[in-house]
Every structure is written in structure tokens, then in C-alpha cells.
């Protein structure tokens, strides 16, 4: 029950996280103009990964996709790539985890297969979350660097006088959405990996036996030892009771002297 809950919760948390990563990637407010110490408030500018927007003091806003013959900054392209990789991995992880859910029955899928799928989706969620966090952090780092460069430039002019007001840009809402979403996806992935341990069958009995309709005689399997999956070791080589079954070693296909008593 706890395993199913952990797996289900991991799935839901990851689902929310991936939805957040998609939302952050599509949002326009990755960098927003810092209005502090800026006397010109006629136009407010903010940028996303895909579009640049300007908002008038009247509230009128216009956005256009990046259109440049000189090419976009390499770092922006890198952030785009990280976010897209995060979304793709997350989406595949979600697809895999749906089939891995313990509460969903698909044909005669074994628990070991579900455990493997749960682990796979968990790893995918972890990598997806890390990609999103990395992408957002790289972008944030660029903004911090630019912010302090702009601040330094603001106060370096002829004889210490301010010549032109340099616009500074600060963190947009998308960065916070991205960080939280990446974190949730990461947590969801960890939960799926934990659930995988509980899903894996503890013990499997491997018996190579042939059954015969022979009286009421009871035989014990001479070497029937428990096979371990790796999650629980079988230190005591316990015998396994086999009802009326005989192992291949015990089956005698030729007549013996006891048959004619």
C-alpha cells in the first residue's frame, strides 16, 4: 500500500513539475526590466526564451518573436536546449510511469517489469528536473552578471557624473516557476526510484519439476533453494516443500527391483 502511495504521489508531483517546466519555457517573463532608479517609465521591457515584449505605461503590451540575422546569443540557445530536453525527458518519463503504476493493470505485466519501468521513469524525472534547474540557473547567472555590469556602468561617467541611464534587468517570474517546477520534478523522480525498491519482488522460487500422478507419497526437493532478486539475500538455504512433486533427479524412467515387490 505504501509503495503504491509513494509511486502515485511521485507521479503526481512529477506531473505538476513537468507542467511547470512547460509553463516556464513558454513564459515571456524570464528577464524583466528593473524599474528601480529608472526615471523613464514610459516603456517597460521584458524578455522570454522566444519573444521580446514591451509594455506601455497605458498598459498596452506588444510581443514579437526574436527575429535577428546575427543569430541569438549562444547562452540563450543553450538554455532553450536544456528546457526542451527537460520537457522531452519528462514527457517520456510520464508516459513510461503511467504503464508502471501499480494501480493500473495492463495484461499480465509482472511486478519486476513494473519495477524496472518505475525506476526508468524516476531517473528520467530526475534528469528532467536537473535540466530545468540548470537552464534556469544559467539564465539567472547571466542576468546577475549583467545587472552588476549595468550598475557599475551607471556610475562611471565623465568626472563621476552619470551620462546615460543604463537599464538593468532582473529575474522574471518564469525563473521562479522554473526553479520550483524543476525541484518538484526532481522530488517526484526520487519518489519513483524509492517506490521501485518496494515494487521489486522480494523472493522468487525457481523449481524445475515434473509432476506425476503418483499416489500419496511426499517428496522433499533436495536442493530447492530460494533465489534472490538482489534486494533480499537468502543466507539460509531453506528447503522448499513441494507437495507431491518430484524433481527431475528423482524421476526414474527405467524399472527398479522395488517395482516387483
Amino acid at each position: 500500500m505504501a509503495v503504491t502511495a509513494c509511486q502515485g504521489l511521485g507521479f503526481v508531483v512529477s506531473l505538476i513539475g513537468i507542467a511547470g517546466i512547460i509553463a516556464a519555457t513558454c513564459m515571456d517573463q524570464w528577464s524583466t526590466q528593473d524599474l528601480y532608479n529608472n526615471p523613464v517609465t514610459a516603456v517597460f521591457n521584458y524578455q522570454g526564451l522566444w519573444r521580446s515584449c514591451v509594455r506601455e505605461s497605458s498598459g498596452f503590451t506588444e510581443c514579437r518573436g526574436y527575429f535577428t540575422l546575427l543569430g541569438l546569443p549562444a547562452m540563450l540557445q543553450a538554455v532553450r536546449a536544456l528546457m526542451i530536453v527537460g520537457i522531452v525527458l519528462g514527457a517520456i518519463g510520464l508516459l513510461v510511469s503511467i504503464f508502471a503504476l501499480k494501480c493500473i493493470r495492463i495484461g499480465s505485466m509482472e511486478d519486476s517489469a513494473k519495477a524496472n519501468m518505475t525506476l526508468t521513469s524516476g531517473i528520467m524525472f530526475i534528469v528532467s528536473g536537473l535540466c530545468a534547474i540548470a537552464g534556469v540557473s544559467v539564465f539567472a547567472n547571466m542576468l546577475v552578471t549583467n545587472f552588476w555590469m549595468s550598475t557599475a556602468n551607471m556610475y562611471t561617467g565623465m568626472g563621476g557624473m552619470v551620462q546615460t541611464v543604463q537599464t538593468r534587468y532582473t529575474f522574471g517570474a518564469a525563473l521562479f516557476v522554473g526553479w520550483v517546477a524543476g525541484g518538484l520534478t526532481l522530488i517526484g523522480g526520487v519518489m519513483m526510484c524509492i517506490a521501485c525498491r518496494g515494487l521489486a519482488p522480494e523472493e522468487t522460487n525457481y523449481k524445475a519439476v515434473s509432476y506425476h500422478a503418483s499416489g500419496h507419497s511426499v517428496a522433499y526437493k533436495p536442493g530447492g533453494f530460494k533465489a534472490s532478486t538482489g534486494f533480499g539475500s537468502n543466507t539460509k538455504n531453506k528447503k522448499i516443500y513441494d507437495g507431491g512433486a518430484r524433481t527431475e533427479d528423482e524421476v526414474q524412467s527405467y524399472p527398479s527391483k522395488h517395482d516387483y515387490v
Partner: nanobody
Framework: QVKLEESGGGLVQAGGSLTLSCAAS????????MAWYRQAPGKQRELVAR???????TYADSMKGRFAISRDTAKNTVYLQMNSLKPEDTAVYYC????????????????WGQGTQVTVSS
């Protein structure tokens, strides 16, 4: 950063025409949007017209039909053709550029020129 320099302002009779120009210090291909704003004494700075990198334009309602924004990519210059000028068009006209410096990192900017005075006498 992108430095902007306006020119073409001056005194003009009502009903007359004037062309303002704004020269950018870097290729305007790297600029997302260039715009003209104006500020009359005691009033807030308002949008006149803007031209985006893809060539699309936007005009303030009161200037539609009278004003036209254009650009010359070879000269890295944006123009504002003003026709049928009225005394209420008297203001300081500012050039604005918004974009990203593509030097590897993501360095956005929103820069203004010093402004050029346009006076329309009746």
C-alpha cells in the same frame, strides 16, 4: 550598449512636414524593436510609433495616417516621417531601442536617445 542619436527636429508651421532620424551605434538587425516616443511639457512620455525587427509597425491612434515609421538597415537608421503637423504635436521626440546584445551571453537593453525638439507654430 546601443547608443542612439536623434536629428531632424526644429520649428515648423502647422500643416507642414518634418522627418526625424535616429542612428544606432550597432547593427539594427540585433535590435528587437525601435520606436519613437514624445514628451510634451508637463506630460508623460507617450508612444508615437514603433518598428519591430520583422518589419511590422505599430502607431499611436492619434498619429495613424499622419506619421510613418521606416528604417534603412544599411545605415542602421530609423526614420519618422511626420505630415500634417498640428500645434499639439509640439514635444521632445525620443528614439528608443530594445534588444539583446548577442555576444554569447544574454544581455538585454532598453536604451534612449537624448531627444530632439519639434515645435509646431500656428
Amino acid at each position: 550598449q546601443v547608443k542612439l542619436e536623434e536629428s531632424g527636429g526644429g520649428l515648423v508651421q502647422a500643416g507642414g512636414s518634418l522627418t526625424l532620424s535616429c542612428a544606432a551605434s550597432r547593427s539594427i538587425f540585433s535590435i528587437d524593436v525601435m520606436a519613437w516616443y514624445r514628451q510634451a511639457p508637463g506630460k508623460q512620455r507617450e508612444l508615437v510609433a514603433r518598428i519591430w525587427a520583422d518589419g511590422s509597425t505599430t502607431y499611436a491612434d492619434s498619429m495613424k495616417g499622419r506619421f510613418a515609421i521606416s528604417r534603412d538597415t544599411a545605415k542602421n537608421t530609423v526614420y519618422l516621417q511626420m505630415n500634417s503637423l498640428k500645434p499639439e504635436d509640439t514635444a521632445v521626440y525620443y528614439c528608443n531601442a530594445v534588444g539583446t546584445i548577442a555576444d554569447g551571453a544574454f544581455r538585454p537593453y532598453n536604451n534612449w536617445g537624448q531627444g530632439t525638439q519639434v515645435t509646431v507654430s500656428s
